[in-house]
C-alpha cells in the first residue's frame, strides 16, 4: 500500500495527497477549544485504470462494467484520528479522539 | 452509519449501493478455482454536500475549499472479505480470506 504525496508546486495530475491546514478559527467554529488548526490534508487527482487502486474490487467492477458505474475516484485510503477538546451540545467540555480527521494516504476506489 | 441500497429499477440519483455479481468464469480468470462467481456490489450516484458523508474530514475539506479538491465521490465506506481458493504465481493452490471484495455500504468521501 502506497500513495503519492504532492504539494502546491507539483505538476502531478494523478491521484495524490496534498497538504491542507484546517483552521477552525477561520471557520468560526468556536466550540472547538483545541486544536485551533491542524494538518488535515486532502486527496485530488485523476484515477487512471489500475493506478493506486486500493481494492481488487475496484478492478473487478471495472471489468464487469455495470450500468452507471463511474470508475474509481481519488479518495482517502488511510486516515488517522486527532485528539480534540470541544464543547458538546450540553456545553460540557469533552476531550476525545476523533476518528478519520487526517488523510495519511490517497488512492483510487 | 448507513447507506442507501438500490437496484436496477431505482430512480435514486444519490450515492447508492447497487447489486453486482462478479463472474470470474466470464472474465476467463480460471486461476480462481472458487468461487466462480460472487456478489460484489458497487457504488454509484451523486454526492450532494453533506449527503452520506462518512468522515467529518470531508466536510472540513469542503469548508476549506483548497485548489483542485473535487468534492466527495460515491465510494465504498464498508467492505467485507470473501474466502477464495486460487492458484498463486508458483501454481500452488492457496486458500485465503481476500479483504475488501464485497461492498457492504456506500457513502460520500
Amino acid at each position: 500500500d502506497f500513495g503519492l504525496d504532492c504539494d502546491e508546486h507539483s505538476t502531478e495530475s494523478r491521484c495524490c495527497r496534498y497538504p491542507l491546514t484546517v483552521d477552525f478559527e477561520a471557520f468560526g467554529w468556536d466550540w472547538i477549544i483545541a486544536p485551533k488548526r491542524y494538518k488535515a490534508n486532502y486527496c485530488s487527482g485523476e484515477c487512471e485504470f489500475v493506478f493506486l487502486q486500493k481494492y481488487p474490487h475496484t478492478h473487478l467492477v471495472h471489468q464487469a462494467n455495470p450500468r452507471g458505474s463511474a470508475g474509481p475516484c481519488c479518495t482517502p485510503t488511510k486516515m488517522s484520528p486527532i485528539n480534540m477538546l470541544y464543547f458538546n451540545g450540553k456545553e460540557q467540555i469533552i476531550y476525545g479522539k476523533i476518528p478519520a480527521m487526517v488523510v495519511d494516504r490517497c488512492g483510487c476506489s | 452509519d448507513f447507506g442507501l441500497d438500490c437496484d436496477e429499477h431505482s430512480t435514486e440519483s444519490r450515492c447508492c449501493r447497487y447489486p453486482l455479481t462478479v463472474d470470474f468464469e466470464a472474465f476467463g480468470w480460471d486461476w480462481i478455482i472458487a468461487p466462480k462467481r460472487y456478489k460484489a456490489n458497487y457504488c454509484s450516484g451523486e454526492c450532494e454536500f453533506v449527503f452520506l458523508q462518512k468522515y467529518p474530514h470531508t466536510h472540513l475539506v469542503h469548508q476549506a475549499n483548497p485548489r483542485g479538491s473535487a468534492g466527495p465521490c460515491c465510494t465504498p465506506t464498508k467492505m467485507s472479505p470473501i474466502n477464495m481458493l486460487y492458484f498463486n504465481g508458483k501454481e500452488q493452490i492457496i486458500y485465503g480470506k481476500i479483504p475488501a471484495m464485497v461492498v457492504d455500504r456506500c457513502g460520500c468521501s
Epitope: - | 480460471d30 478455482i33 492458484f87
Partner: antibody, heavy 124, light 107 residues
Framework: QVQLVQSGAEVKKPGASVKVSCKAS????????MHWVRQAPGQGLEWIGN????????NYNQRFKARATLTVDKSTSTAYMELRSLRSDDTAVYYC?????????????????WGQGTLVTVSS | DIQMTQSPSSLSASVGDRVTITCKAS??????LSWFQQKPGKAPKTLIY???RLVDGVPSKFSGSGSGTDYTLTISSLQPEDFATYYC?????????FGQGTKLEIK
C-alpha cells in the same frame, strides 16, 4: 447441460499403453478439476488422480504415478488419461468425473458429473 | 493413505425397511466424506457430501451423519430403485480413498 463423454472400449496386450479420452461440454472446461477413477470387474472404486485444465496442475495416487499421465487439450475441452505398461490387473472401467466446489473451505468438493466409463481389457 | 472400512459388505433388506451403512476411517477426516450409489453398468452417483449434505435432486430418504472417523448413511424407507451398491469416499487428503462398497440386495 454439463456432460462428459468418454471414448470407446479398448482391448490391449500386456505391456502396451492405453489413452482414454473424456470430452467435456456445457461448462467452462478449464476452470474445474477433472478426476479419474477406475473400477476393476466386480471390485470397488480406486482414485487415479486429478488435473486442473487451466494450468495442467495435477495430483496422482502414488500407486499410479509411475505409469499414469493426465493431460488436457483445452482447444477441444478434452481430458486424457494414459496408462502405460499395462498388466492384466489393469482391466477395469475407467471413469472421468468433474469435481464441483460447493463451499467456503479448502476441501469443499464433490463429484457432480461422471463420464459413462470406458472399459479397458488387458489380455494376451 | 487413509483406509476406509465399510460395513456390512452386503445387506439383504425388504421394501419399506430402514437400513444403515457405516464407514470408518483410519484417521479423522474432518467430515470430508461423500456417499455414492452405483447400479450395475452405470457410473456412481453422489448422494451425500460433507458427511450430511444432500445433493440437489436426491430424495430426502437418504441421510448422512457422523464426524471424526465414524460415518453413517441411512435410507429411511427402501424402494425397489434403491437396491444397488453404495460406496463412501474420504476427500480430506490425497490420495482420495473409497470404502470397499456395500451391496444392498432385495430379501
Amino acid at each position: 447441460q454439463v456432460q462428459l463423454v468418454q471414448s470407446g472400449a479398448e482391448v490391449k496386450k500386456p505391456g502396451a499403453s492405453v489413452k482414454v479420452s473424456c470430452k467435456a461440454s456445457g461448462y467452462s472446461f478449464t476452470g474445474y478439476f477433472m478426476h479419474w477413477v477406475r473400477q476393476a470387474p466386480g471390485q470397488g472404486l480406486e482414485w487415479i488422480g486429478n488435473i486442473y485444465p487451466y494450468n495442467s496442475v495435477s495430483n496422482y495416487n502414488q500407486r499410479f504415478k509411475a505409469r499414469a499421465t493426465l493431460t488436457v487439450d483445452k482447444s477441444t475441452s478434452t481430458a486424457y488419461m494414459e496408462l502405460r505398461s499395462l498388466r492384466s490387473d489393469d482391466t477395469a472401467v475407467y471413469y472421468c468425473a468433474r469435481r464441483y466446489y460447493y463451499g467456503t473451505g479448502p476441501a469443499d468438493w464433490y463429484y457432480d458429473v461422471w463420464g459413462q466409463g470406458t472399459l479397458v481389457t488387458v489380455s494376451s | 493413505d487413509i483406509q476406509m472400512t465399510q460395513s456390512p459388505s452386503s445387506l439383504s433388506a425388504s421394501v419399506g425397511d430402514r437400513v444403515t451403512i457405516t464407514c470408518k476411517a483410519s484417521q479423522d477426516i474432518n467430515s470430508y466424506l461423500s456417499w455414492f450409489q452405483q447400479k450395475p453398468g452405470k457410473a456412481p452417483k453422489t448422494l451425500i457430501y460433507r458427511a450430511n449434505r444432500l445433493v440437489d435432486g436426491v430424495p430426502s430418504k437418504f441421510s448422512g451423519s457422523g464426524s471424526g472417523t465414524d460415518y453413517t448413511l441411512t435410507i429411511s424407507s427402501l424402494q425397489p430403485e434403491d437396491f444397488a451398491t453404495y460406496y463412501c469416499l474420504q476427500s480430506d487428503e490425497f490420495p482420495l480413498t473409497f470404502g470397499q462398497g456395500t451391496k444392498l440386495e432385495i430379501k
